[in-house]
Interface confidence: medium
C-alpha cells in the first residue's frame, strides 16, 4: 500500500483542480517522472460532475477532468492522487463553469477518539454554500487488512465497508469508523466518496494506523492549590484508557490589580508549578493533552478553571508536626490594593501573644517567616485543636490565619509472643496523645533479617499491620508467624490529609518478649516426718532457654495471704518449705521467665492444695482428769477420766483413737482401746493404779503423755 | 572512616581466659549491633557472637555458648569478647566487625588467639 | 542451621576472564538475605555484595550478585589483577550466621 496517503496527524486538503493546473503542482512519489500516462491508474484520481445544465449558474457547457489529490495544511505542494478504488481512471463531462474557476476543496481531519473504539473523520466543503440545493451526501469506505504485505496492490472493492458520513450542516461531516482493539496498530486504508447533484468526487486512497492519530480525551480534575513554599501548583490527571504516556499544554492567565499575565507551557508531568503568586489575583486555566513520545492530536482543551487567591496568602496554610520538631510560616499580604512589605509584617498567635522579633526572617520584599522552635503540644481550646498562627501589619491583623497542630505522638508499643512461640501480639494506646479529627492510625514495621542489631529507625522498605481496638482502649496486633530472632521495628503512623506523623521506632525481637506457658503438673504437699511443705513442678516445653520460677504459697481460704519464693537454679523442679501449720490446707502456684531476665512472667499455674494427713505421730497424749465415784471405806471405786479432744497441731495432724495403758502392782500392764471417745471408766480396786491416755493417728501413739497414779488412802477430788 | 582497632590476642593455656577488645571510630557505635568472626589458621570464616546497639541482646554460635561473653561499653565505644575454658579449637585469628542488618560492613584487621599448652 | 556450600573451591583465571562463583544454601535463604566478601592474605574480609545482588559502598561495578532461594551467584565480569583473593558467602536470614566455605580464585 506505499501508494495510499499517509494521514496526517493535522488538518489536510482534498484538492480537486480546474483543467488548467499543470502536473507541476503536484509531489510526485520518486521515481516517477511527469508524463506518466493517466491510463496507468495509480497516481490521479478523475471526477466527472455532472450538473443539471437547467441550473442557473450553468452555462457553456465543456467536458472537463477533475484532478482530486490531498494537500497538507503544512504543505505548498499537493500529493499525487492513487487510484480510484476500482483502479480505472474517471474521465467525466463537467456541466458548469463553476469547477473551472473555482478549486472543489475540503478541508479534512481525523482521530481516533480517546476511548479508542471509534476512528473519527471530520470533512468539511470549502464550498460552503455552493452545495446547498444539491443532494450533498459524503461515505467513507474502509478496510483494516487482515494482514499488511508490502505492495502496491489495492485491495479489492468487495473488501471494503462503507459508512454514511453525518452531515449535519452541510459544510461539516462527522464519518465514524469502529475500530477493533487489537486493530488499533494494524493500517487502515480509506477513501472518501462525495456525492453533490449527481457529480462524485471520489478521494485517493488513504491509509492510516490508528494508534498514531489518538486524539486523547481533555485531561481530567484540573484544580489549583498553593504548596508549601509559596508556588501555585496546577494539577490534572491524565483521561482514562490513554495506552501510552501524555505531553500537556498549559495555558493560564493571571490577573491581578497589579499585573496582567498569561503562559503557556508544554509539560510531561500532570502538574505545573506557578511562581511568584500575588494575593488577591485570579488564575484562569486550562490544560490539553498530546501522544508524548509519538505522533498523535491534541485533545481539546479542558473546561477553564479559575483560583482566586485570598489578600493573605499562608503557606502552607495548615501545619501538622510532632513534639520537638521545629517548623515555619511563610505570608504575602496585600492591604488596599498594595502588598505589605515583609519588614512590617509581625506575627501573633491565636491573637494572644505576639511572637518574639526573633523569630520572623525576611524572605524577601514581600515575603516573610515565622519560625517555632521545639514545640510543645497544642493545648485543645473549646473545639479548636490547633493553635491559630495570624500574619498581621503593624496596626491590625488579617481576620484569616493558619493552623497549627502539635501533637504528642509518643506512643509505647508492647509486645508479647506466647508460650508456644506461634505469634507474637503488639498492644499499644493512643489515650497518650490528642486525637485529631478525620487521622487514621497504622502500625508499620519493618522485619530484619536477625536480631535488632541496629538502633530502631523507620526504614524506607516498611508494610502496614493490622490492628483491632479492643474494650480496653488498646488496639491490638498479631504477628503470626512470626520469626523468633528477626527484629521487628514498628512504629504508629498517623495518617491526615495534613500529611503524616510517625511515632519513634521501636525495635522487638519476639524470641526476647516470649511470656511461657506457667509451669505444669504442680504439687503441694507435707512431707511425712519432715513437716516441710513440698512443691514441684514441670518447666514448660517452651522455651528453651533458662528459667527461673516464682513460688507464691498460702493458707488456703477466701483472702489468700501470699507468701514469695524464688528460685533461679532452672534445673530445680522442686523445693520445701517450713511453714508454721503443718496441719493446714495451703495453696501454692508456680511461674516461670526466662533466666536472663528477658521477656514477661509466665501466669500462674492453676493453684495446688496440700492434703490435711498425719505428719508424725501425736506430739503428746491428752491431758485428763479423774472422777472418782464410791465409798471411801470401800476397797473397790469406779473412776472416770475427762480429756479434750487433742488440737490439730498437737495431733499432727489427726487422731484415729485414744488408749488407756493401766499399770498395777498385781496385774501388771495391760491396755484399752477407747476408740474417739473423751471419757473413761475404769474400777479401781488396788492399792495403786496407774493410767496413761495415749492419743493414736496413722504414724502411731504420742511419745510423750500425761499419766496419774490412783492410791489409797485419798479422797474424791474434782 | 569507620575504623576497629583490635587487641587483647595472644597465646594462652587450654582451660585459662583472654579478654578481646575492639575500640570503634568513624560512626556512631551506639547505633549498631557489633560481630565477632573467627577464622582458623587456612580455614574459612565462622561467626561467633553478636550483641545489639545497647547491649540487651546477645546470641552466640553453639560452639562458644556458655564460655564466652561478648559485652561492649557505649561510653568508650568499645566491644569485648570475654573468652573462659579455652579450648584448642578456638585457636584462630578473631575479627570484630560492625554489623549492619547481620552482614558485616565493616572488620577489624583481626587478632590472633593461640590455645597451646 | 543454613549450611552453604561454595563452589568450585579453586578457579584458575585468567585477567581479563568472566569468573562465575557458586554458592548454595541447605535451605532457603529467607528475602535474600545473603552477602558476598572477597579476602585477601593476611587481610580481614571486604564486603561486595549484600541482599544477593546490591554492591556495597565503592564496589567496582564488574562484580554482580544474582539468585534467590537456595541458589546464588557471584560474577567478576572481567577479571583485574587484584580480584585474585578467596571469595566467601554468607546468610543472615536464619541464627546462626553462617558462612560458605570459600572459593579461590587464582591466576592461570
Known amino acids: 500500500f506505499n501508494l495510499s496517503y499517509p494521514i496526517t496527524p493535522w488538518r489536510f486538503k482534498l484538492s480537486c483542480m480546474p483543467p488548467n493546473s499543470t502536473y507541476d503542482y503536484f509531489l510526485l512519489p520518486a521515481g516517477l517522472s511527469k508524463n506518466t500516462s493517466n491510463s496507468n491508474g495509480h497516481y490521479e484520481t478523475a471526477v466527472e460532475p455532472k450538473f443539471n445544465s437547467s441550473g442557473t449558474h450553468f452555462s457553456n457547457l465543456s467536458k472537463t477532468t477533475f484532478h482530486c489529490c490531498f494537500r497538507s495544511e503544512q504543505d505548498r505542494n499537493c500529493s499525487l492522487c492513487a487510484d480510484n478504488i476500482e483502479g480505472k481512471t474517471f474521465v467525466s463531462t463537467v456541466n458548469s463553469l463553476v469547477f473551472q474557476q473555482i478549486d472543489a476543496n475540503w478541508n479534512i481531519q481525523c482521530w481516533l477518539k480517546g476511548d479508542l473504539k471509534l476512528f473519527i473523520c471530520y470533512v468539511e466543503s470549502l464550498f460552503k454554500n455552493l452545495f446547498r440545493n444539491y443532494n450533498y451526501k459524503v461515505h467513507l469506505l474502509y478496510v483494516l487488512p487482515e494482514v499488511l504485505e508490502d505492495s502496491p496492490l489495492v485491495p479489492q472493492k468487495g473488501s471494503f465497508q462503507m459508512v454514511h458520513c453525518n452531515c449535519s450542516v452541510h459544510e461539516c461531516c462527522e464519518c465514524l469508523v469502529p475500530v477493533p482493539t487489537a486493530k488499533l496498530n494494524d493500517t487502515l486504508l480509506m477513501c472518501l466518496k462525495i456525492t453533490s447533484g449527481g457529480v462524485i468526487f471520489q478521494s485517493p486512497l488513504m491509509s492510516v494506523q490508528p494508534i498514531n492519530m489518538v486524539k486523547p480525551d481533555p485531561p481530567l480534575g484540573l484544580h489549583m492549590e498553593i504548596t508549601d513554599d509559596g508556588n501555585l501548583k496546577i494539577s490534572w490527571s491524565s483521561p482514562p484508557l490513554v495506552p501510552f504516556p501524555l505531553q500537556y499544554q498549559v495555558k493560564y492567565s493571571e490577573n491581578s490589580t497589579t499585573v496582567i499575565r498569561e503562559a503557556d507551557k508544554i509539560v510531561s508531568a500532570t502538574s505545573l508549578l506557578v511562581d511568584s503568586i500575588l494575593p488577591g489575583s485570579s488564575y484562569e486555566v486550562q490544560v490539553r493533552g498530546k501522544r508524548l513520545d509519538g505522533p498523535g492530536i491534541w485533545s481539546d482543551w479542558s473546561t477553564p478553571r479559575v483560583f482566586t487567591t485570598q489578600d493573605v496568602i499562608y503557606f502552607p496554610p495548615k501545619i501538622l508536626t510532632s513534639v520537638g520538631s521545629n517548623v515555619s510560616f511563610h505570608c504575602i499580604y496585600k492591604k488596599e490594593n498594595k502588598i505589605v512589605p515583609s519588614k512590617e509584617i509581625v506575627w501573633w498567635m491565636n491573637l494572644a501573644e505576639k511572637i518574639p522579633q526573633s523569630q520572623y526572617d525576611v524572605v524577601s520584599d514581600h515575603v516573610s517567616k515565622v519560625t517555632f522552635f521545639n514545640l510543645n503540644e497544642t493545648k485543645p481550646r473549646g473545639k479548636f485543636t490547633y493553635d491559630a498562627v495570624y500574619c498581621c501589619n503593624e496596626h491590625e491583623c488579617h481576620h484569616r490565619y493558619a493552623e497549627l497542630y502539635v501533637i504528642d505522638v509518643n506512643i509505647n508499643i508492647s509486645c508479647e509472643t506466647d508460650g508456644y512461640l506461634t505469634k507474637m501480639t503488639c498492644r499499644w494506646s493512643t489515650s497518650t496523645i490528642q486525637s485529631l479529627a478525620e487521622s487514621t492510625l497504622q502500625l508499620r514495621y519493618h522485619r530484619s533479617s536477625l536480631y535488632c542489631s541496629d538502633i530502631p529507625s523507620i526504614h524506607p522498605i516498611s508494610e502496614p499491620k493490622d490492628c483491632y481496638l479492643q474494650s480496653d482502649g488498646f488496639y491490638e496486633c498479631i504477628f503470626q508467624p512470626i520469626f523468633l530472632l528477626s527484629g521487628y521495628t514498628m512504629w504508629i503512623r498517623i495518617n491526615h490529609s495534613l500529611g503524616s506523623l510517625d511515632s519513634p521506632p521501636t525495635c522487638v525481637l519476639p524470641d526476647s518478649v516470649v511470656k511461657p506457658l506457667p509451669p505444669s503438673s504442680v504439687k503441694a504437699e507435707i512431707t511425712i516426718n519432715i513437716g516441710l511443705l513440698k512443691i514441684s513442678w514441670e518447666k514448660p516445653v517452651f522455651p528453651e532457654n533458662n528459667l527461673q520460677f516464682q513460688i507464691r504459697y498460702g493458707l488456703s481460704g477466701k483472702e489468700v495471704q501470699w507468701k514469695m519464693y524464688e528460685v533461679y537454679d532452672a534445673k530445680s523442679k522442686s523445693v520445701s518449705l517450713p511453714v508454721p501449720d503443718l496441719c493446714a490446707v495451703y495453696a501454692v502456684q508456680v511461674r516461670c521467665k526466662r533466666l536472663d531476665g528477658l521477656g514477661y512472667w509466665s501466669n500462674w499455674s492453676n493453684p495446688a492444695y496440700t492434703v490435711v494427713m498425719d505428719i508424725k505421730v501425736p506430739m503428746r497424749g491428752p491431758e485428763f482428769w479423774r472422777i472418782i465415784n464410791g465409798d471411801t471405806m470401800k476397797k473397790e471405786k469406779n473412776v472416770t477420766l475427762l480429756w479434750k479432744p487433742l488440737m490439730k497441731n498437737d495431733s499432727l495432724c489427726s487422731v484415729q483413737r485414744y488408749v488407756i495403758n493401766h499399770h498395777t502392782s498385781c496385774n501388771g500392764t495391760w491396755s484399752e482401746d477407747v476408740g474417739n471417745h473423751t471419757k473413761f471408766t475404769f474400777l479401781w480396786t488396788e492399792q495403786a493404779h496407774t493410767v496413761t491416755v495415749l492419743a493414736i493417728n496413722s504414724i502411731g501413739a504420742s511419745v510423750a503423755n500425761f499419766n496419774l497414779t490412783f492410791s489409797w488412802p485419798m479422797s474424791k477430788v474434782n | 572512616q569507620v575504623q576497629l582497632l583490635q587487641s587483647g590476642g595472644g597465646v594462652v593455656q587450654p582451660g585459662r581466659s583472654l579478654r578481646l577488645s575492639c575500640a570503634a571510630s568513624g560512626f556512631t557505635f551506639s547505633s549498631y549491633g557489633m560481630h565477632w568472626v573467627r577464622q582458623a589458621p587456612g580455614k574459612g570464616l565462622e561467626w561467633v557472637a553478636v550483641?545489639?546497639?545497647?547491649?540487651?541482646?546477645?546470641y552466640y554460635a553453639d560452639s562458644v555458648k556458655g564460655r564466652f561473653t561478648i559485652s561492649r561499653d557505649n561510653s568508650k565505644n568499645t566491644l569485648y569478647l570475654q573468652m573462659n575454658s579455652l579450648r584448642a579449637e578456638d585457636t584462630a585469628v578473631y575479627y570484630c566487625a560492625k554489623g549492619y542488618e547481620n552482614y558485616f560492613d565493616y572488620w577489624g584487621q583481626g587478632t590472633l588467639v593461640t590455645v597451646s599448652s | 542451621e543454613i549450611v552453604l556450600t561454595q563452589s568450585p573451591d579453586t578457579l584458575s583465571l585468567s585477567p581479563g576472564e568472566r569468573a562465575t562463583l557458586s554458592c548454595r544454601a541447605s535451605q532457603s535463604v529467607a528475602s535474600n538475605y545473603l552477602a558476598w566478601y572477597q579476602q585477601k592474605p593476611g587481610q580481614a574480609p571486604t564486603l561486595l555484595i549484600y541482599?544477593?545482588?546490591t554492591r556495597a559502598t565503592g564496589i567496582p561495578d564488574r562484580f554482580s550478585g544474582s539468585g534467590s532461594g537456595t541458589d546464588f551467584t557471584l560474577t567478576i565480569s572481567r577479571l583485574e589483577p587484584e580480584d585474585f583473593a578467596v571469595y566467601y558467602c554468607?546468610?543472615?536470614?536464619?541464627?546462626?550466621?553462617?558462612f560458605g566455605g570459600g572459593t579461590k580464585v587464582e591466576i592461570k
Open positions: 550483641i545489639s546497639y545497647d547491649g540487651s541482646n546477645k
Open positions: 554468607q546468610q543472615y536470614s536464619a541464627s546462626p550466621l553462617t
Open positions: 541482599n544477593a545482588s
